[in-house]
């Protein structure tokens, strides 16, 4: 997250970290069910671990943390590497979470976002770009949903209805390492960090997010079919 600020503790209990061994964070994810996460399809790895209820980036033990294995990862069948459409994936955890103040699911919004909606994006991704500098703790940033026209103008012929753009002033954006993490609007999960320009936070080049309102049926049916 570029030019965000430290999230208040316990305010993002649905935020998950996807880790490669030993403790390398490579993507964010979101708890949407007691045993299921959503993340970006481009975050798929065969071997990874899931950390929930953790505030700092470092692997130091925190009393609220819960660690999991992913037993199943189900990318949206319409995703096409290295493209950006349908950039979402469900991950089934090896057991159900223990609900606490630090670990709690969030509902996926069934309403599509309108331009001007205020949202919050979070993650442990780099805080500088093109340099790489990772934060000590989870970062939060307020962003506003842009109209689909402004989004298409920013990225001609690259935007479809499975994506939406959001941003703030130049110099504020999500970035590498935030992928798969949540965009929360009005208390519901509206999007996942998907892609954007490089370097991040360039003027008139907003972040692009997976438009989850288009996928509520697929999410529900996939969880039911695999529970």
């Amino acid at each position: 997250i570029i030019n965000g600020s430290d999230c208040d503790m316990h305010t993002q209990p649905w935020q998950a970290a996807l880790l490669l061994r030993p403790n390398q964070l490579y993507c964010g994810a979101v708890l949407v069910h007691p045993q299921w996460l959503l993340t970006a399809a481009h975050c798929r790895k065969k071997v990874f671990r899931v950390r929930l209820g953790h505030y700092s980036l470092s692997p130091v033990y925190e009393s609220g943390q819960q660690m999991f294995q992913g037993v199943k990862s189900i990318p949206h069948p319409g995703y096409s590497h290295p493209g950006h459409s349908n950039d979402l994936m469900l991950i089934k955890l090896n057991r159900r979470i223990r609900p606490t103040k630090d670990v709690r699911p969030i509902n996926v919004s069934s309403h599509c976002p309108s331009a001007g909606t205020k949202c919050l994006v979070s993650g442990w991704g780099t805080t500088k770009s093109p340099q790489v500098h990772f934060p000590k703790v989870l970062q939060c940033l307020n962003i506003s949903v842009l109209s689909q026209k402004r989004c298409e103008d920013a990225y001609p012929r690259q935007i479809d209805d499975t994506m939406f753009c959001a941003g703030d002033k130049a110099g504020r954006d999500s970035c590498q390492g935030d992928s798969g993490g949540p965009v929360v609007c009005n208390g519901s999960l509206q999007g996942l960090v998907s892609w954007g320009d490089y370097p991040c936070a360039r003027p008139n080049r907003p972040g692009v997010y997976t438009n989850l309102c288009k996928f509520t049926k697929w999410i529900q049916e996939t969880i039911q079919a695999n529970s």
Epitope: L20, R21, A41, R44, K45, K46, V47, Q69, V71, K72, I74, P75, H76, P77, G78, Y79, S80, H81, P82, N94, N226
Partner: antibody, heavy 117, light 110 residues
Framework: EVQLQESGPGLVKPSGTLSLTCAVS????????MSWVRQPPGKGLEWIGD???????DYASWAKGRVTISQDSSKNQVSLKLSSVTAADTAVYYC???????????WGQGTLVTVSS | AYDMTQSPSSLSASVGDRVTITCRAS??????LAWYQQKPGKAPKLLIY???TLASGVPSRFSGSGSGTDFTLTISSLQPEDFATYYC????????????FGGGTKVEIK
């Protein structure tokens, strides 16, 4: 050097159990998923199953109930057991490492197992 | 079931030819497809993963494309060392799968 080496009896009697081990060197099992694949003489590749560092195991549907895949991280080896074998299980058996992006990037040289009395 | 069907099962070609092998999945596997080359008596070798990403050390005459259900492996200019059997493998799911591999395509000298 990253290497995989399968070993085990080359001949197994019908209705017996085929047991193979895959010795892993040059990387820790804790970081990778491992696969077993077989190839009957003159035929194509058949996936048998995968084992993950967390000991989660996926088996091919034909192998469920007959195959057991396990690993010993302290010895850095993966094992395959196939019970109630018949002549149809005669094949070259390979172990392979997944590159973490769903491609098998390192393979053992394979070991031929013949099922015959 | 996610069945993988390769075509053709064999083909004859000459050095320098452009060769195309196709792999079709019975359901969408998104981009989780790998291609392997196998020579007689040897273990398979990874050529391409994620449908289009070239594995380390693989010559650039090999390329992969496709997503969903239809995939292609192309050898832009066939070399003598490319005569072998090629297999595709899906990595989308392991649930209730008989085989993740396609049946293979043998590339022979014309």
């Amino acid at each position: 050097e990253v290497q995989l080496q399968e070993s085990g009896p080359g001949l197994v009697k019908p209705s017996g159990t085929l047991s193979l081990t895959c010795a892993v060197s040059g990387f820790p099992l804790s970081n990778y998923a491992m696969s077993w694949v077989r190839q009957p003489p003159g035929k194509g590749l058949e996936w048998i199953g995968d084992i993950y560092p967390s000991d989660i195991i996926d088996y091919a549907s034909w192998a469920k109930g007959r195959v057991t895949i396990s690993q010993d991280s302290s010895k850095n080896q993966v094992s395959l057991k196939l019970s109630s074998v018949t002549a149809a299980d005669t094949a070259v058996y390979y172990c392979a490492r997944d590159n973490n992006d769903y491609g098998l990037d390192i393979w053992g040289q394979g070991t031929l197992v013949t099922v015959s009395s | 079931a996610y069945d993988m069907t390769q075509s053709p099962s064999s083909l004859s070609a000459s050095v320098g030819d452009r060769v195309t092998i196709t792999c079709r999945a019975s359901q969408s596997i998104s981009s989780w497809l790998a291609w392997y080359q196998q020579k007689p008596g040897k273990a398979p070798k990874l050529l391409i993963y994620l449908a289009s990403t070239l594995a380390s050390g693989v010559p650039s005459r090999f390329s992969g494309s496709g997503s969903g259900t239809d995939f292609t492996l192309t050898i832009s200019s066939l070399q003598p060392e490319d005569f072998a059997t090629y297999y595709c493998q899906q990595g989308y799911t392991n649930s209730n799968i008989i085989n993740t591999f396609g049946g293979g395509t043998k590339v022979e000298i014309k």
